[in-house]
């Protein structure tokens, strides 16, 4: 296969099992030169975009999407894509966020490290305006 744009990756800090009320940060990574990262939830119609992209390494850029207080409704499948002009990438594999009843308070360390780098999760369908990478509609529902 040929890949003009490398597939992004997604991870979650501090993990993918988060107590209710705690925070979680999704980290999307892609090549340098990314203008916009998009975090999608379940399907392509629900997403958040950011142009706050930092350079994680000489060959990699990243963006961070933070949920300050996780609710049960935040549980689900998340994936990243990015816009590197003039193209949108394929999706990352999916990462599943699990929300559990808090037992040790909002800063409880009872979480599992999470990242997605293979089909144990999934990549998926695609819908992104090649020429309008920021949050310009696309029947967008914001994630949080």
């Amino acid at each position: 296969q040929e890949e003009d744009l490398p597939r992004p990756s997604i991870s979650a800090e501090p993990g993918t099992v988060i107590p209710l009320g705690s925070h979680v940060t999704f980290v999307c990574r892609g090549p340098v030169g990314v203008q916009t990262f998009r975090l999608e939830r379940d399907s392509r119609s629900t997403y958040n975009d950011t142009e706050d992209v930092s350079q994680a390494s000489p060959s990699e850029s990243e963006a961070r999407f933070r949920i300050d207080s996780v609710r049960e409704g935040n549980a689900g499948l998340y994936r990243c894509i990015y816009y590197k002009p003039p193209k949108w990438s394929e999706q990352s594999d999916y990462l599943e966020l699990l929300v559990k009843e808090s037992s040790g308070g909002p800063d409880s360390p009872d979480t599992e490290p999470g990242s997605s780098a293979g089909p144990t999760q999934r990549p998926s369908d695609n819908s992104h305006n090649e020429h309008a990478p920021a949050s310009q509609g696309l029947k967008a529902e914001h994630l949080y």
Partner: antibody, heavy 119, light 111 residues
Framework: SVKESGGDLVKPGASLTLACTAS?????????MCWVRQAPGKGLEWIGC???????IYYASWAKGRFTISKTSSTMVTLQMSSLTAADTATYFC??????????????WGPGTLVTISS | ELDLTQTPASVSEAVGGTVTIKCQAS??????LAWYQQKPGQRPKLLIY???SLASGVSSRFRGSRSGTEYTLTITDLECDDAATYYC?????????????FGGGTELEIK
Amino acid sequence: SVKESGGDLVKPGASLTLACTASGFSFSDGYYMCWVRQAPGKGLEWIGCIHSSSGSIYYASWAKGRFTISKTSSTMVTLQMSSLTAADTATYFCARDSESYGYNPCELWGPGTLVTISS
Amino acid sequence: ELDLTQTPASVSEAVGGTVTIKCQASQTISNYLAWYQQKPGQRPKLLIYAASSLASGVSSRFRGSRSGTEYTLTITDLECDDAATYYCQCTYYGTTYVGGAFGGGTELEIK
């Protein structure tokens, strides 16, 4: 919708290019555009897919070398086939992954175009 | 290369009955599995995506499930119109492995 064209009767050893024309959606939205074939009385056989925005292309291992998938315009994907044999006789379908479902299922299918290889 | 083994190759069942079709993946493909129905001379129709989610407009008599690398399509309360060939497909396209493969198909005859 998607519609295939270019099916024909050709001789063994020949080459043929099929086209898949899209309407009602934009390639820039990043769909997997796939080619699938079906020999008479046989099952579905995946050939490969191209991601219409990123340009990534994926082939079945048996198709690498003789089959080439390309995006030739903002509304057209092609399948180039070479060194054709009787075993390549089939209806060739173009399919697009879903607008609204995850996990890339082929939701939109063309009617197919018949390729016959015979001397 | 990913392989999907679909069983049985053919099955005959009476109207009102239930039929179960299985698809065994040679490696882990998570929920990247779809089921299609195809009638003679027609294009395939998507029934199930993401292993167990019902496509829009498809009867709830069709149900998909997953156990590890084994996927099952169950059709209940069979109707004459269900006579068709059913295919599973891995819908993962990526670098870890290339999916796309279809199962061999199951021809369903309604008695």
